[in-house]
């Protein structure tokens, strides 16, 4: 007996074959004997089957001999053994229907579970094997569960299921909610303008939800919520600012913060948080923001950053074309009686300069320039 | 009154290179994006290039991507575009455009234009 | 990418007469459509942004209307000022794109 397997919602053309390259009389038939389909003449006639809408034949292949089932919008329980009648013999055709979905919506955030569910015809025994967008392979029966997705399993997952040595392929595409970077970090100037952005790693026609900016600065005992926003249709309206700092919100994705200059008082940590319509949970992202001040009190020139740097950062003082002055893995380094030049200021990883500032030291008898 | 006033368009040979300036003046430069527009008889009017308030972020459409930057002073109320590997399809009138948002959004003034030929 | 297709190319209006000029996405774009008047020698002006609104200074013989992809300029009596380009701009998402234009000419 051949078995041919069929996807829920697709369509299946079971073939039968006459030894007689003409057209002859065929009958198609159920395994309880009712007909579904057969021939006239040159007519297609129907029978009572719970098929009739949607079983169909190709007249253009009776002349050949050929005289296959079509079943359009296949269901699970189409699953059953197909009989063609002709030439006084039969042919034989299991059809085992499956279908594949996710069991929640396609669209997930970041860090929850999907599961898939296979719906297969009572007797079968199928396996199914899940391959992710990143190359990952899951294995299982029934049901496949995946937990903690990430930004890489956002793609179309194609899953195979095994059946009587055949095979048929499902298609799933999963979006996974998520910014595209989990945390970023931005180095400024004290006075310069600082903007926070925070794309996100999916596109969708409408998006709906509501969102806030939770900051914690370096100097603070506590974080306070410095915006809250809500999105409506991709359009984004601020609903509360702080007075201090006031920011500025972008009314277009992706979503984007404007702090009118930085402030020692204002380095720290952030958390922006995005609160989808009709999703649990929400999306994160971190932002760090690290202010530098360079400055001269009498004798003595000074160059701090505040916020969120790491140990192996290097600070250092240095001349204008010269070599560094002091260079410390500290957040204030300072020089005694700097002679009259350009000083710079680096913050620098690994050699390479994250953040810049430059002071002018005049002769003693004048006062600094800031450039 | 605000106003936008282009300059650097040239006649190029293809695959050369060109900087276009865009000096700004009547309003608060650096609280605004900037965009660059170019027009042609055939395309009609098209997106090249946009720059944040702060200058931090910039978007591209795919066809400039790679090969035109845009950027910003705003110390001296400047835009800039560096065109790089010209081609004869670039060959337009640049429009320097302000948004009516801090990032972007549509364009609510635009400069009087200066002319690019790619040409050999 | 959100495409924009304005129609028509070109209209001959007599004076005092309604002029229509339609802009149909591909996407929906809620109610995110611009529209600008260019005349020659001249950039494009601003004359409608976003939600249907009208820009200060533009006379309210000038209006538009829809919401989703299909989207509707109007001059209710045709002036002889009014000969101009007239672009539409959907400005829901990046890449931001134009309509073709729409040549308008006194008949």
């Known amino acids: 007996k051949k078995v041919v397997l069929g996807k829920k919602g697709d369509t299946v053309e079971l073939t039968c074959t006459a030894s007689q390259k003409k057209s002859i009389q065929f009958h198609w038939k159920n395994s309880n004997q009712i007909k579904i389909l057969g021939n006239q003449g040159s007519f297609l006639t129907k029978g009572p089957s719970k098929l009739n809408d949607r079983a169909d034949s190709r007249r253009s292949l009776w002349d050949q001999g050929n005289f296959p089932l079509i079943i359009k919008n296949l269901k699970i329980e189409d699953s059953d053994t197909y009989i063609c009648e002709v030439e006084d013999q039969k042919e034989e055709v299991q059809l085992l229907v499956f279908g594949l979905t996710a069991n929640s919506d396609t669209h997930l955030l970041q860090g929850q579970s999907l599961t898939l569910t296979l719906e297969s015809p009572p007797g079968s025994s199928p396996s199914v094997q899940c391959r992710s967008p990143r190359g990952k392979n899951i294995q299982g029966g029934k049901t496949l569960s995946v937990s903690q997705l990430e930004l890489q399993d956002s793609g179309t997952w194609t899953c195979t299921v095994l059946q009587n040595q055949k095979k048929v392929e499902f298609k799933i595409d999963i979006v996974v909610l998520a910014f595209q970077k989990a945390s970023s970090i931005v180095y400024k100037k004290e006075g310069e303008q600082v903007e926070f952005s925070f794309p996100l790693a999916f596109t969708v026609e409408k998006l709906t939800g509501s969102g806030e900016l939770w900051w914690q600065a370096e100097r603070a005992s506590s974080s306070k919520s410095w915006i809250t926003f809500d999105l409506k249709n991709k359009e984004v309206s601020v609903k509360r600012v702080t007075q201090d700092p006031k920011l500025q919100m972008g009314k277009k994705l992706p979503l984007h913060l404007t702090l009118p200059q930085a402030l020692p008082q204002y380095a720290g940590s952030g958390n922006l948080t995005l609160a989808l319509e009709a999703k649990t949970g929400k999306l994160h992202q971190e932002v760090n923001l690290v202010v530098m001040r360079a400055t001269q009190l009498q004798k003595n020139l000074t160059c701090e950053v505040w916020g969120p740097t790491s140990p192996k950062l290097m600070l250092s003082l240095k001349l204008e074309n010269k070599e560094a002055k002091v260079s410390k893995r500290e957040k204030a380094v300072w020089v005694l009686n700097p002679e009259a030049g350009m000083w710079q200021c680096l913050l620098s990883d690994s050699g390479q300069v994250l953040l810049e500032s430059n002071i002018k030291v005049l002769p003693t008898w004048s006062t600094p320039v800031q450039p | 009154e605000v106003q936008l006033v282009e300059s650097g368009g040239d006649l190029v040979k293809p695959g050369g290179s060109l900087k276009l300036s865009c000096a700004a003046s009547?309003?608060?430069?650096?609280?605004?994006?900037m965009s660059w527009v170019r027009q042609t008889p055939d395309k009609g009017l098209e997106w090249v290039a946009t720059?944040?308030?702060?200058?931090?972020?910039?978007y591209y459409p795919d066809n400039v991507k790679g090969r035109f930057t845009i950027s910003r002073d705003n110390a001296k109320n400047t835009l800039y575009l560096q065109m790089s590997s010209l081609k004869s399809e670039d060959t337009a009138m640049y429009y320097c455009?302000?948004?009516?948002?801090?990032?972007?959004?549509?364009?609510?003034?635009w400069g009087q234009g200066t002319t690019l030929t790619v040409s050999s | 990418e959100t495409t924009v297709t304005q129609s028509p190319a070109s209209l001959s209006v007599a004076i005092g007469e309604k002029v229509t000029i339609r802009c149909i996405t591909s996407t929906d774009i809620d109610d995110d459509m611009n529209w600008y008047q260019q005349k020659p020698g001249e950039p494009p002006k601003f004359f409608i942004s976003e939600g249907n609104t009208l820009r200060p200074g533009v006379p309210s013989r000038f209006s538009s209307s829809g919401y989703g992809t299909d989207f509707v300029f109007t001059i209710e009596n045709m002036l002889s000022e009014d000969v101009a380009d007239y672009y539409c701009l959907q400005s829901d998402t990046l890449p931001l794109t134009f309509g073709s234009g729409t040549k308008l000419e006194i008949k």
């Open positions: 009547g309003f608060t430069f650096s609280s605004y994006g």
């Open positions: 455009a302000r948004h009516e948002d801090g990032n972007w959004n549509y364009f609510d003034y």
């Open positions: 720059i944040s308030s702060g200058g931090s972020y910039t």
